[in-house]
Amino acid sequence: KIDACKRGDVTVKPSHVILLGSTVNITCSLKPRQGCFHYSRRNKLILYKFDRRINFHHGHSLNSQVTGLPLGTTLFVCKLACINSDEIQICGAEIFVGVAPEQPQNLSCIQKGEQGTVACTWERGRDTHLYTEYTLQLSGPKNLTWQKQCKDIYCDYLDFGINLTPESPESNFTAKVTAVNSLGSSSSLPSTFTFLDIVRPLPPWDIRIKFQKASVSRCTLYWRDEGLVLLNRLRYRPSNSRLWNMVNVTKAKGRHDLLDLKPFTEYEFQISSKLHLYKGSWSDWSESLRAQTPEEEPTGMLDVWYMKRHIDYSRQQISLFWKNLSVSEARGKILHYQVTLQELTGGKAMTQNITGHTSWTTVIPRTGNWAVAVSAANSKGSSLPTRINIMNLCEAGLLAPRQVSANSEGMDNILVTWQPPRKDPSAVQEYVVEWRELHPGGDTQVPLNWLRSRPYNVSALISENIKSYICYEIRVYALSGDQGGCSSILGNSKHKAPLSGPHINAITEEKGSILISWNSIPVQEQMGCLLHYRIYWKERDSNSQPQLCEIPYRVSQNSHPINSLQPRVTYVLWMTALTAAGESSHGNEREFCLQGKAN
């Protein structure tokens, strides 16, 4: 064996292990004939704390008193320096600074399951910074004792490896943990318990759910438990919810009926177990069971609205629209909608099932009284039908809401306000606010939106399917029995100047004046509701200011006459469009020379 300290020794007094704040004496001494050759009195012994010089002395030994060492381990090394040579390593020693163990606190023991083993945990208290040994002792009836030791540096858990059995569930057991290191020892307070106190059942397993006759109202949850379980608690919630419903049951024997589940809803179920009413602890929650409850027939009624469009003297187009039922009303997957159209006087009726749409369009005669009924069907049945009599919604002028306005209200919202109709306002049963994107040409494929408002309301905030920089045609209907009156307005939630001006596509001469025709600005370039068009003209090659004519915007209008041009003068014409935010850039320029006679 190589002697690392063949030249000398480092000794530490009172011990290599000291209490924080203590002083230690370190001595470095050379062995005989190990000093500097020929120059023994020139021996220079140097003490290093790790690699930092802290003391030196000429001679055969060096004594150093060291204080203020930090918690943990510090390495001291002694070296010999001779003239004209490198320092020679003599010896080294470690000093361990720590504290005595604190009393272990909160000792608690548990046995996981009836077949599990007893394991205990405790709080060590502050770190000792020293090797500390923990001994856990368990004593039981008939002077039985078990002991387990732990030499891990951070020991706060030990498993005895023994199984407590339920033969005598009221027998007392006592556990105690003792911590020992070089500076002292300390024991926890004893913890006394019975089998029932410390056995924590295994979580229930094999969880299943059954719905008798595929009905949500006849639902039973089944599970398996350890033999001695007396109590269970169940928790369940819809998968999209954070709040649990909680049920406590006694002597359930692995089954429980649930009475308050909603149909067609995915639920998460968990179960926990306990051996005794007031002793011991609950098991962990079981693994989740996820299951969907069966469908039930829909409740509630569809919100139905309609639009009429004149086709010719004998026919009209009816477009029906309805909103989806809420999930809680649908109570299942809606398979189809049933639409029944009936002529009330003649009794003729036609029924159609609509799948994949929430609208239906048909053509009916303009004569007769017509009614529709719409219901939603799932695998279990149909909702109550919503019945509507088809009438001329805007026929009663005296029922028309007054002073309708539409103003932007924050991002993608429009506030619609109105005044009640002149006719007895108390006759109004409800208002309907309807909106759809404004499309020149009145495209009937554009989706229709509506909301219903109580008769005492004179405003509604519309936000569904509202986009920035789009103009909406908004109608407010006042309904009273089989009569209706309406008013309309254009509105947008956000606007800016149009991106382009109208494109002049033709200029024609008519009896000394001209007719200008143009193409509408594409909807995506209008940037809100158009208020006006402007037609500009000036003589070609002239530097004078152009003249202009401002025309209020009307959806269907795309031509306008001008009669102030001089014959046989060539003019340049162009157009712009305006929203409330400003004027567009010029559209295309066209030249025109009026051929007619001078006045």
Epitope: D51, L75, G92
Partner: nanobody
Framework: QVQLVESGGGLVQPGGSLRLSCAAS????????MSWFRQAPGKGPEWVSA??????????YYADSVKGRFTISRDNAKKTLYLQMKSLKPEDTAVYYC????????????????RGEGTQVTVEP
């Protein structure tokens, strides 16, 4: 008493391999960084490699001259430091010794607290 004892040196041909060991005793080992140094005849000590305190997954550092050829490791349970040397060259000939050190290891020679006596490695055809 603190002790570091190197072993595993010997004579090897160029391109060959050796594995050096350093057995520690008399101190706790685990809380310290450890390094390998070498000293060729007539030259000063040269730092070769280091490994951080703690487990075998401690960070490792190498001198440019040995990067990719030498691998340092430690086994705290056995209180042993290792240096696996591959693709040895004649210029690797030196006495190799282990030491208790402290960083940094990137751009300066590490601080040395205690070193072993060393083991001779000779690389020649």
């Amino acid at each position: 008493q603190v002790q570091l004892v190197e072993s595993g040196g010997g004579l090897v041909q160029p391109g060959g391999s050796l594995r050096l060991s350093c057995a520690a005793s008399g101190f706790t080992f685990e809380p310290y960084d450890m390094s390998w140094f070498r000293q060729a005849p007539g030259k000063g000590p040269e730092w070769v490699s280091a490994i951080d305190k703690g487990g075998g997954a401690g960070a490792t550092y190498y001198a440019d001259s040995v990067k990719g050829r030498f691998t340092i490791s430690r086994d705290n349970a056995k209180k042993t430091l290792y240096l696996q040397m591959k693709s040895l060259k004649p210029e690797d000939t030196a006495v190799y010794y282990c030491a208790i050190t402290a960083g940094p290891y990137s751009d300066s020679t590490p601080r040395v607290a205690y070193r072993g006596e060393g083991t001779q490695v000779t690389v020649e055809p």
